[in-house]
Amino acid sequence: QAAKEVLLLDSKAQQTELEWISSPPSGWEEISGLDENYTPIRTYQVCQVMEPNQNNWLRTNWISKGNAQRIFVELKFTLRDCNSLPGVLGTCKETFNLYYYETDYDTGRNIRENLYVKIDTIAADESFTQGDLGERKMKLNTEVREIGPLSKKGFYLAFQDVGACIALVSVKVYYKKCWSIVENLAVFPDTVTGSEFSSLVEVRGTCVSSAEEEAENSPRMHCSAEGEWLVPIGKCICKAGYQQKGDTCEPCGRRFYKSSSQDLQCSRCPTHSFSDREGSSRCECEDGYYRAPSDPPYVACTRPPSAPQNLIFNINQTTVSLEWSPPADNGGRNDVTYRILCKRCSWEQGECVPCGSNIGYMPQQTGLEDNYVTVMDLLAHANYTFEVEAVNGVSDLSRSQRLFAAVSITTGQAAPSQVSGVMKERVLQRSVQLSWQEPEHPNGVITEYEIKYYEKDQRERTYSTLKTKSTSASINNLKPGTVYVFQIRAVTAAGYGNYSPRLDVATLEEASGKMFEATAVSSEQNPV
């Protein structure tokens, strides 16, 4: 393919005389001839077939090799059959010799034959007879030879005639190169083929404008000795904001984006976002819409949710249960959670302050996924405001006013605190006498104490209770030689306090005498 060849010499392209050096001058002569298409061209011919021992040299002008290493010489020639020339058998030949001589510069008009290196003896595949001439059969022979690798700046070609009747119709000298191409968005420059027939020249490509090398896969190709690019390795890909169009990367249009070089095509901006310039790698959010740090560029811009709906409450002394419905607008996100803001407000001016850290929230104060919460350990007879805010992944990015549902309540009387200092006063076979101290914070008048007890190995599956108004009690009707667990709590009008820590007591083993003590006032079956 001609496109792979870089011409250094083409005798057919020259319209004027070639003026090569002929030695002796009576040997090769420059004439006007015809090529295979009968187009007039400058040719050299020799037909010194009468005398033996012919040694006619024809030398080209100096040929600069450029950056070539392997040179190709294509000869087109016509050779006359010796049989068509009467009386020349023995002196007529049907071959000629091809030589070259490397130099760094033009050495002048002298042909120093001994410096020339023989490339080959050239013979015709077909010569023509006089009859062929009459039928105008131009039997043109084409022979290609290689020379190289060459080390100097240029060279001469020489043709030695040894007694043939021959016309050099065309001398073409060229080297092969792989012409610059764009493959996989990488530009591979013009590359001269290697010095050996089998050599491959590895060439690294340069990414086209607005493209980048694929990770750890830089573009490479191999230029073969025949001037052909072999299978590409690696590739370039269009950068963020650009997409491939043929051998180039074009910017994404307005309202389109491409966030990563790994994406193939530009995409239309997601909902509630825009790009007002070409080559965008991401789309900006419209006013009031946001993108969370964890949101990929391809998701729509979103906004904070509206306030929760239908907030209701239930007060049990100093515990408040809150419940609500989801917001009407989740802002376009499905990561809605809730947070509770508790404020304690004064009776006078209605000024409110945050509740502080001694308040309990079940299951938690923030990041609530369910739409209910229980707020505990509030002060009795106090005013509180609870704000319930719906929150999503972009709420913290918004500078607009918070949207929440609020409720104001007043707590009732608080239940007493935990009973402390439980002691076993007396332990018998079937009864145990206990005493304890009043709660540190009765939060009102203690109306009674409730004692819960059960056999330890029953693990509270079945328990009994006993109520008493004093800070001591005797629990009867127990089994001898059995370990019992006891817990006590105080009761006021506001409700039950928390049970005291467990106390383990073992009754005495069975004996002959029986003691009659106070019997348990109540015994209830209460499975855990």
């Epitope: 011919q45 050779l79 016309a167």
Partner: antibody
């Protein structure tokens, strides 16, 4: 300069012989074949044949075999045409001409001035 | 043997005019015949040989063309010194001449 010099006119009786010389100068005699051409009075040209000046090998055209002989003396760069048993119809101007061989065709590029041979009783 | 027939036998032209001489072969011959010019009392002179190559010193008003069996010698503008007899000659194992065309002043 390249030239071929032939001898002057010859008058011969029928049955006699004549030897026409052609002396070459200005080039290497043995590098080119020599052709002989006959032109009868008022007639066209007739090619008689040629001789390889290197080997002495002659080629004769039809009608010019037997009585016609081409020969050489390379030492003096001279070609000869000898005609024996002359006949009246042999009366003509005889030209020697240097042969121009090329790949694409041949011709005679240098001619002698011609020698008129008259055969008359 | 190949016979070459030239026509016309005589061609009358004025100086400056174009002259076209024909040479027809009895069978297909060499790519182009050689052409000679002969003036009275002179030896023939080679004009054209090979593939329409002009011999040394021949002006470019002389050109030859043709193929197969029909060949032409053209004198683009006839000069006074061009009035002569012109012969075509085919080459090969045996050479033959045409009978000639005389170009004379009109």
């Amino acid at each position: 300069q390249v030239q071929l010099l032939q001898s002057g006119a010859e008058v011969k009786k029928p049955g006699a012989s004549v030897k026409v010389p052609c002396k070459a100068s200005g080039y290497t005699f043995t590098s080119r074949a020599m052709s002989w051409v006959r032109q009868a009075p008022g007639q066209g040209l007739e090619w008689m044949g040629w001789i390889n000046t290197n080997t002495g090998n002659p080629t004769y055209a039809q009608g010019f075999t037997g009585r016609f002989v081409f020969s050489l003396d390379t030492s003096v760069s001279t070609a000869y045409l000898q005609i024996s048993s002359l006949k009246a119809e042999d009366t003509a101007v005889y030209y020697c001409a240097r042969v121009r061989l090329t790949v694409y065709g041949d011709g005679m590029d240098v001619w002698g001035q011609g020698t008129l041979v008259t055969v008359s009783s | 043997e190949i016979v070459l027939t030239q026509s016309p036998a005589t061609l009358s032209v004025s100086p400056g005019e174009r002259a076209t001489l024909s040479c027809r072969a009895s069978q297909s011959v060499s790519s182009n015949p050689a052409w000679y010019q002969q003036k009275p009392g002179q030896a023939p002179r080679l004009l054209i040989y090979g593939l329409s190559t002009r011999a040394t010193g021949i002006p470019d008003r002389f050109s030859a063309s043709g193929s197969g069996t029909d060949f032409t010698l053209t004198i683009s503008r006839v000069e006074p010194e061009d009035f002569a007899v012109y012969y075509c000659q085919q080459y090969g194992p045996s050479w033959t001449f045409g009978q000639g065309t005389k170009v004379e002043i009109k």
